[in-house]
């Protein structure tokens, strides 16, 4: 049975240019997280695997960088990063937890962050 | 130098279990390094079967997963492969191979042939 | 069925250069690395990574990658270069997929 959340950043909101973090967590579980995968629409941007570590996704190597933790940092945005990204735990017993999180890239210094939700 | 060297029956029965070991020498296991089981049928192409980790955790192919298991030995210099109810489909020369972290398998063993024949 | 996809053979005349490619859709998040088999050998690891060579491995092997395919190039092949090569990458699950293979004939 699945009983764990995920939690995270929500709906954030970030300027042209500049960088965000992106977090998840995964809380009310024991199970063991194997690997995260962060996923924009169909595209991989990374993973944390707990034995093989970071891979970065070599079109983003210029622009993602791993962590903090298990979450990533996307760097230089531009408006085309605007848009929903997944981070999709890999857990051993329970199976695989998503979260999402919608990015907005403004052209101005009007960003602000959204606040935090959960998903269950 | 890293060496790997597969050993075990090179003939097994059809629904037994194929029992191989392969010794590791050169290196130890070690944070960041795996240790996989690769096989090639005869006149074929190469098939992944699966990676034991430092950790001891695993990963295999998931056509194979049902059948497979890969674990480390006391001594900690072998590594074993297990594939149970196998079939004429399973004869292929195994290697026994290792890499580290997310780059690939940078050595080989020699192979060994195992025929699955009654 | 592979998730990776090679031409089964390909030729070249001896001193050309000649491109064998992989394809699959695990090669727009990672590198392929290429492999060298020979008959009754193990396969040699002979690229890895954006274009990285071991050093063991003669210069006139290269990699290149775009999308979702990946090129190995011989430039100036041999004799001794006709074997099976294969590609192989990791999928988004960690597995570790391989291409069915290229067989080289140098004429």
């Known amino acids: 049975m699945m009983t764990g959340t995920i939690e995270t950043t929500g709906n954030i909101s970030a300027e042209k240019g500049g960088s965000i973090i992106l977090q998840c967590h995964l809380s009310s579980t024991t199970a063991q997280v194997t690997q995260v995968n962060w996923e924009q629409q169909d595209q991989l941007l990374a993973i944390c695997n707990a034995d093989l570590g970071w891979h970065i996704s070599p079109s983003f190597k210029d622009r993602v960088a791993p962590g903090p933790g298990l979450g990533l940092t996307l760097q230089s945005l531009t408006v085309n990063d605007t848009g929903e990204y997944f981070c999709i735990y890999h857990t051993y017993p329970d199976g695989t937890y998503t979260g999402r999180i919608f990015l907005e890239v403004l052209e101005s210094s009007v960003a602000e962050h959204g606040a935090r939700f959960q998903i269950p | 130098q890293v060496q790997l060297q597969e050993s075990g029956p090179g003939l097994v029965k059809p629904s037994g279990t194929l029992s191989l070991t392969c010794a590791v020498s050169g290196v130890s296991i070690r944070q960041g390094h795996w240790w996989s089981w690769v096989r090639q049928p005869p006149g074929k192409g190469l098939e992944w079967i699966g990676e034991i980790y430092q950790t001891g955790r695993t990963n295999y192919n998931p056509s194979l997963k049902s059948r497979v298991t890969i674990s480390v030995g006391k001594s900690r210099n072998h590594i074993s492969l297990k594939l149970s109810s196998v079939t004429a489909a399973d004869t292929a020369v195994y290697y026994c191979?290792?890499?580290?972290?997310?780059?690939?398998?940078?050595?080989w063993g020699q192979g060994t042939l195992v025929t699955v024949s009654s | 069925s592979y998730e990776l996809t090679q031409d089964p053979a390909v030729s070249v005349a001896s001193g050309q250069t000649v491109r064998i490619t992989c394809q699959g859709d695990s090669l727009r998040s990672f590198y392929a690395s290429w492999y060298q088999q020979k008959p009754g050998q193990a396969p040699i690891l002979l690229t890895y990574g954006k274009d990285t060579r071991p050093s063991d491995i003669p210069d006139r092997f290269s990699a290149s990658s775009s999308g979702d395919t990946s090129s190995l190039t011989i430039t100036g092949a041999q004799a001794e270069d006709e074997a099976d090569y294969y590609c192989?990458?990791?999928?988004?699950?960690?597995?570790?997929?391989f291409g069915g293979g290229t067989k080289l004939t140098v004429l």
């Open positions: 192989s990458s990791r999928d988004r699950s960690a597995n570790v997929v």
């Open positions: 191979t290792t890499g580290s972290g997310w780059y690939p398998i940078d050595y």
